[in-house]
Interface confidence: low
């Protein structure tokens, strides 16, 4: 027997409340279907029920958590349906507070080289699941270590392409509900860096300023990157502007800092819009000084 | 949809014998740590066996009142589970329910079966 | 083994009033705390697992709570239909066991 094809949009990792949409799909036509849950808590909706083309779930209650199976309509088999489709594994998030996700070194990894994510908890989730964003395959699924405050897991990710790089987060569950996830981490952009040339980094008025003085800082290329990314050492984040075609052939963007207090060694990167957690090499440092402020850093 | 149905119930003598029987239909059967427990007439809930997976080689657990003289038993295949319960008392007359475990509770329960244990 | 001692044992409330059901566990049971409701002359019905989630299909007047070795079943405006027995069961550690049995009526 021919077996349809079950897929669940937008994702098989749904937070508590939202709704997502079970689609089966026959390749032989077939668009009436029958929905079955094979383990987890039980779906009364689903019960004795055939379903057209799709079925929109929800709101979702970790009640909904578990594997999904469809089998279609079938006038040709003795049953008159389908052999079951593959399994769908719905997730639920929300069921328990967030856990923690941290990059060692840090968040921006040369290409080629290997990034730990560290996912950690003041619950002790005996389970964790990373999941990288627009991906529809299934998490991944780790093992946490306990301890007395806790629980987290080290990932060990490379070597680093723009294929892992992307924006992840960390879920984490217990072993009794292995579907029904905590809410998930913040999330972390992991950034693949060196995959093009270097821009040049440069201040106006000047690297020195005066304490409360603007200072405005131009990162520019000949190559065409749509968006420059403007970090300071020892700082998380990262600014982001985009970049604008100069009389002289170059790509620019000009970060206005505004009055500065405190200096700081400065670097740009260069990206594409296609590919926004793939970036160029970093400018060489900029350090920026401030006059008459006793910090500088 | 899900059901269990529970039979192999009835009278029985002291120090008689008796095997129940579940019949498991509507989910997977063998992905279930699979569960017996029992109410004696107008008293509460008491768990007591279990039988893991296949992955688990089967593990089974009882209750300390019915340790050995009640073996609890599945069929993957028949999507059945048992009890045999052997030296038989009065105590252990109650109403026994099959039930599968998950998310540490038991969601679904069959209507039960009662053994009454009486000379 | 872990006790669960459950209290009151029964109880009579009016409709609309709420009602709070505790039970205690004899030692932690990290969460894993499931209420069930028995109407008279049938089968247990799952309510509430793991604390506080609730049931597909339940009321949402039913809310569990607690951490530890302390749990509470709550339903915040008693209804006719709500007449029943309600045992907590810990699924923590084996052997699993149910609390003693709350039952609950109308005035």
């Known amino acids: 027997q021919d077996k349809p094809f079950l897929s669940a949009w937008p994702g098989t990792v749904v937070s508590e409340g939202q709704h997502v949409t079970l689609q089966c799909r026959s390749r032989l036509g077939f668009n009436e279907f029958s929905l079955s849950k094979e383990d987890g808590m039980p779906v009364p909706e689903l019960y004795n029920r055939i379903f057209r083309n799709s079925f929109l779930m929800g709101p979702v209650t970790p009640a909904h958590a578990g594997t999904y199976r469809c089998c279609s309509s079938h006038p040709h088999s003795p049953t008159g349906w389908s052999a079951p489709s593959n399994p769908v594994v719905i997730m639920v998030t929300g069921v328990h507070r967030k856990p923690s996700l941290l990059a060692h070194p840090g968040p921006l990894v040369k290409s080629g080289e290997t990034v730990i994510l560290q996912c950690w908890s003041d619950v002790r989730f005996e389970r964790f699941l990373l999941h990288r964003e627009g991906i529809t395959e299934d998490p991944l699924r780790l093992v946490g270590q306990l301890h007395d405050a806790g629980s987290q897991v080290n990932y060990s990710m490379g070597p680093m392409t723009p294929a892992l790089a992307g924006t992840y987060r960390c879920f984490g569950s217990v072993t009794h509900l292995p579907y029904e996830l905590s809410a998930p981490s913040d999330p972390l952009d992991i950034v693949v860096v060196g995959l093009y040339g270097k821009p040049s980094l440069s201040a106006q008025p000047g690297p020195t300023v005066q304490a409360g003085e603007n200072v405005t800082l131009s990162c520019s290329s000949r190559s065409l990157f749509d968006i420059y990314h403007l970090s300071r050492e020892a700082e998380a984040g990262e600014l982001r502007l985009t970049a604008v075609l100069r009389v002289n052939g170059t790509f620019q963007a000009n970060f206005p800092l505004g009055p500065v207090t405190h200096g700081g060694n400065y670097r740009c990167f260069g990206s594409f819009r296609a590919l926004p957690h793939a970036w160029s090499d970093p400018s060489d440092p900029l350090p920026v000084s401030v006059t008459g402020n006793s910090r500088h850093l | 949809e899900l059901q269990l149905v529970e039979s192999g119930g009835g009278l029985v003598q002291p120090g008689g014998s008796l095997r129940l029987s579940c019949a498991a239909s509507?989910?997977?059967?063998?992905?279930?740590?699979m569960n017996w427990v029992r109410q004696a007439p107008g008293k509460g809930l008491e768990w007591v066996a279990e039988?893991?997976?296949?992955?688990?080689?089967?593990?089974?657990h009882y209750a300390e009142s019915v340790k050995g003289r009640f073996t609890i038993s599945r069929d993957n295949a028949k999507n059945s589970l048992y009890l045999q319960m052997n030296s038989l008392r009065a105590e252990d007359t109650a109403v026994y329910y099959c039930t599968p475990f998950y998310g540490s509770s038991f969601p679904y329960w069959g209507q039960g079966t009662l053994v009454t244990v009486s000379s | 083994d872990i006790q669960m001692t459950q209290s009151p044992s029964s109880l009579s409330a009016s409709v609309g009033d709420r009602v709070t059901i505790t039970c205690r566990a004899s030692?932690?049971?990290?969460?894993?705390l499931n209420w069930y409701q028995q109407k008279p002359g049938k089968v247990p019905k799952l309510l509430i697992y793991?604390?506080?989630i609730l049931q597909l299909g339940v009321p949402s007047r039913f809310s569990g709570s607690g951490s530890g070795t302390d749990y509470t079943l709550t339903i915040s405006s008693l209804q006719p239909e709500d007449v029943a027995t309600y045992y907590c069961?810990?699924?923590?550690?084996?052997?699993?066991?149910f609390g003693g049995g709350t039952k609950v009526e109308i005035k």
């Open positions: 039988i893991r997976l296949k992955s688990n080689n089967y593990a089974t």
């Open positions: 030692q932690d049971i990290s969460n894993y």
């Open positions: 793991y604390t506080s």
């Open positions: 069961q810990q699924g923590n550690a084996l052997p699993f066991t």
């Open positions: 509507g989910f997977t059967f063998s992905n279930y740590w």
